[in-house]
């Protein structure tokens, strides 16, 4: 069953997924679907990574850690009811059926009325952007020379809500880790 | 317009070994999967195998993929599938298809296909 | 492997009458389905993808609906070209597997 993420209508979400590059630079393709994974590739493509970069994103989705070290966890920028369901990272190894495939449970809460507004830390601006590019057709990608040896890491649930970028950070540095491979 | 014209289908004996080649035309070969499907004769389809756009990611039928192997050459415009240990229950029209492709979608159903190929396995 | 299962296996029909084929999934794809049609001793042509997607070129009288583990193929009024066989095929879990197929045949 899915792994679940809690987010409220307003708030950023972030969806973690990981893998380890064998060695800097050497990047796998990832992909982020708006439901569960398919046979291939993602549904309902979000975002995009090649073996450089990330070469599409669509509006309010995009990547806050480095993705060059394997960090590929999506943020969704100030999420709705309608963005509840079941997204899809996709991290795809070479090799035959070598794809690693994970589906995880976005809810969305209605907002809480509080009495007095509260400050949040920005979260855009704990984590910058950090895409370059925006493909516009099919993307074209290099042959690397060996195929990496790669180790995943898909983070466990350690809370059901984010509430700022201090956990997020916390979060992604945590020991709590499953090893996948 | 899009084209795919597969070759070199025939009778070959059980045990036997054939390639398959798909030739593409009509769009950009590399920004697409590939895929094998195939047909016995009066039978329902069948996957067999695909791959993707840069051949460095390949998915088998689980019972075929210790004989059979997809390929292909973006230079060259082609797909080819290579059987071994051909048997009769291999007999089939094998077809090419291409994975139905644009960014926000993903590649599992096929928006052109082949003609087809017969592979004949019989003694 | 995800079981797809068809029904009728085969239909006959007349021109301009309604015809539904239905596609049962051994377990949930959501809406990870495609259907074609195919003329004998011709290829598959795709119709509609994911469940209810018309594909290009496609006429509108065909309509596919359906998710989860159920799903139809509807032709709201038969033309002669339309008798042919009619297969459904999942893409949400390897490997990709395709019904057993439907006959469309003209009464």
């Known amino acids: 069953s899915e792994v679940e993420y809690r987010a409220e209508v307003g708030q950023n979400a972030y969806l973690p997924c990981f893998y380890t590059p064998a060695a800097p630079g050497n990047l796998v393709p990832v992909c982020w679907g708006k439901g569960a994974c398919p046979v291939f590739e993602c549904g309902n493509v979000v975002l995009r990574t090649d073996e450089r970069d990330v070469n599409y994103w669509t509006s309010r989705y995009w990547l806050n850690g480095d993705f060059r070290k394997g960090d590929v966890s999506l943020t969704i920028e100030n999420v709705t009811l309608a963005d509840s369901g079941i997204y899809c990272c996709r991290i795809q190894i070479p090799g035959i059926m070598n794809d690693e495939k994970f589906n995880l449970k976005l809810v969305i809460k209605p907002a809480k009325v509080t009495p007095a507004p509260t400050r949040q830390r920005d979260f855009t601006a704990a984590f910058p952007r950090m895409l370059t590019t925006r493909g516009h057709g099919p993307a074209e990608t290099q042959t690397l020379g060996s195929l990496p040896d790669i180790n995943l890491t898909q983070i466990s649930t350690l809370a059901n809500e984010l509430r700022d970028s201090r956990l997020a950070n916390d979060l992604r540095d945590s020991g709590a880790t499953i090893r996948i491979g | 317009e899009v084209q795919l014209v597969e070759s070199g289908g025939g009778l070959v004996k059980p045990g036997g070994s054939l390639r398959l080649s798909c030739a593409a035309s009509?769009?950009?070969?590399?920004?697409?999967?590939m895929t094998w499907v195939r047909q016995a004769p009066g039978k329902g389809l069948e996957w067999v195998a695909s791959?993707?756009?840069?051949?460095?990611?390949?998915y088998y039928l689980d019972s075929l993929k210790s004989r059979f192997t997809i390929s292909r050459d973006n230079a060259k415009n082609s797909l080819y599938l290579q059987m071994n240990s051909l048997r009769a229950e291999d007999t089939a029209v094998y077809y090419c298809?291409?994975?139905?492709?644009?960014?926000?979608?993903?590649?599992?159903?096929?928006?052109?296909w082949g003609q087809g190929t017969l592979v004949t396995v019989s003694s | 492997d995800i079981q797809m299962t068809q029904s009728p296996s085969s239909l006959s029909a007349s021109v301009g009458d309604r015809v539904t084929i239905t596609c049962r999934a051994s377990?949930?794809?959501?809406?990870?389905l495609t259907w074609y049609q195919q003329k004998p001793g011709k290829s598959p042509k795709l119709l509609v993808y994911?469940?209810?997607t018309l594909a290009e070129g496609v006429p509108s009288r065909f309509s596919g609906s359906g998710s989860g583990t159920q799903f139809s193929l509807t032709i709201s009024s038969l033309q002669p070209e339309d008798f042919a066989n009619y297969y459904c095929?999942?893409?949400?879990?390897?490997?990709?597997?395709f019904g057993q197929g439907t006959k469309l045949e003209i009464k």
């Open positions: 298809a291409r994975g139905y492709y644009y960014y926000g979608s993903s590649p599992n159903y096929f928006d052109y």
């Open positions: 994911n469940a209810k």
């Open positions: 095929q999942q893409h949400y879990g390897t490997p990709l597997t």
């Open positions: 791959i993707n756009y840069d051949g460095r990611n390949t």
């Open positions: 009509g769009f950009t070969f590399s920004d697409y999967y």
């Open positions: 377990e949930n794809i959501y809406s990870y």
